[in-house]
């Protein structure tokens, strides 16, 4: 028989490699049987994770799994770092592992010099 | 410099579509966001949609069934269509350039906008 | 969606005199910009992201606010300064304008 537990299927050091700039939505599967839990995503700072408010987030349901869904529109540089979801169900809260998002700053990117520009201009 | 500026029809009848383009000039569509904007006397500023730099949209939900948004880097030209006009889409239409800093993202040049009738 | 509602729709004041319009948003949203217009031009980018005054904004304009409440301030008014001013939210698609208030000169 199958548990009826809530469970977040986020994998151990999943990571996200993504362009600031550009749409991004970072995706919390969420098992559940019969009454949706409230879903959170927040953010790691040192060994706090603070929630993230004023985010939009939306929920995607499919046949045999849900997501909540943390929109970024865009992603920006300060997006950078780890999330988590948490649900709270019941009396119950569980925790999602940690994923991390690693944003390239496609702005500052094509401004800077190149690695061979850099070193030409080294030994010229 | 940078430069938005958006060409229309001027006129457009009534259950037809509209094309509007968009040219840009001193920013490159595959870094930068294009958002169109529209401005009528009785809704006052309504964001439309905007192409992404990597080719995705997003739209507003409102008026999301009868908008497309598309682009040629190439030509650095975004193109936005609308179908089914009715008079209350009479507005000038803007394009705007979206950017990015490190916590926040605004529409920062705006292109000086096409006037846009719908009358039979 | 959220609504932002600006106060005073029509703002009248004197040169030298201090000026505050108010935007209030039917949600938290994280920060707040703030658009100029001038009759026949398009909107300018006037104040980003609650405070940060765009290029070439005089000194005497400030911004401020969190949560559901923002604030546009002009320390001292001047005849450049009577215009529509909008505030903006890119929180939420869709990202939303306030109906403006109109600054005018006495």
């Known amino acids: 028989k199958e548990s009826c537990d809530v469970q977040l299927y986020i994998k151990r050091q999943s990571e996200h490699s993504i362009l600031a700039g550009d749409p991004f939505e970072l995706e919390c599967p969420v098992k559940y049987c019969a009454n949706r839990p409230h879903v959170t995503w927040c953010k790691l700072n040192g060994t706090t994770c603070v929630k993230l408010e004023d985010r939009q987030t939306s929920w995607k349901e499919e046949k045999n799994i849900s997501f909540f869904i943390l929109h970024f529109e865009p992603v920006l540089p300060n997006d950078n770092g780890s999330y988590r979801c948490s649900a709270n169900f019941q009396s119950n809260r569980i925790e999602s592992h940690s994923t991390t998002l690693y944003v390239t700053d496609v702005k500052s990117a094509s401004e800077r010099p190149s690695k061979d520009e850099m070193a030409s201009r080294f030994w010229a | 410099q940078v430069q938005l500026k958006e060409s229309g029809p001027g006129l457009v009848a009534p259950s037809q579509s509209l094309s509007i383009t968009c040219t840009v000039s001193g920013f490159s569509l595959t870094t930068y966001g294009v958002h169109w904007v529209r401005q009528s006397p009785g809704k006052g500023l309504e964001w439309l949609g905007v192409m992404w730099p990597g080719g995705r949209t997003s739209y507003n939900p409102a008026p999301m069934s009868r908008l497309s948004i598309s682009k040629d880097n190439s030509k650095s030209q975004v193109f936005l269509k609308m179908n089914s006009l009715q008079t209350d889409d009479t507005a000038m239409y803007y394009c705007v350039r979206g950017d990015y800093e490190y916590d926040y993202y605004a529409m920062d040049y705006w292109g000086q906008g096409t006037s846009v009738t719908v009358s039979s | 969606q959220i609504v932002l509602s600006q106060s005073p729709a029509i703002l009248s004041a004197s040169p030298g005199e201090k000026v505050t319009m108010t935007c209030r948003a039917s949600?938290?949203?994280?920060?707040m910009h703030w658009y100029q217009q001038k009759p026949g031009s398009s909107p300018k980018p006037w104040i980003y992201?609650?405070?940060n005054l765009a290029s070439g904004v005089p000194a005497r304009f400030s911004g401020s606010g969190s949560g559901t409440s923002y604030s546009l301030t002009i320390s001292r008014m001047e005849a450049e300064d009577a215009a529509t001013y909008y505030c903006h939210q890119w929180s939420s698609n869709p990202y939303t304008f306030g109906g403006g208030t109109k600054l005018e000169i006495k």
């Open positions: 949600s938290s949203v994280s920060y």
């Open positions: 992201a609650t405070s």
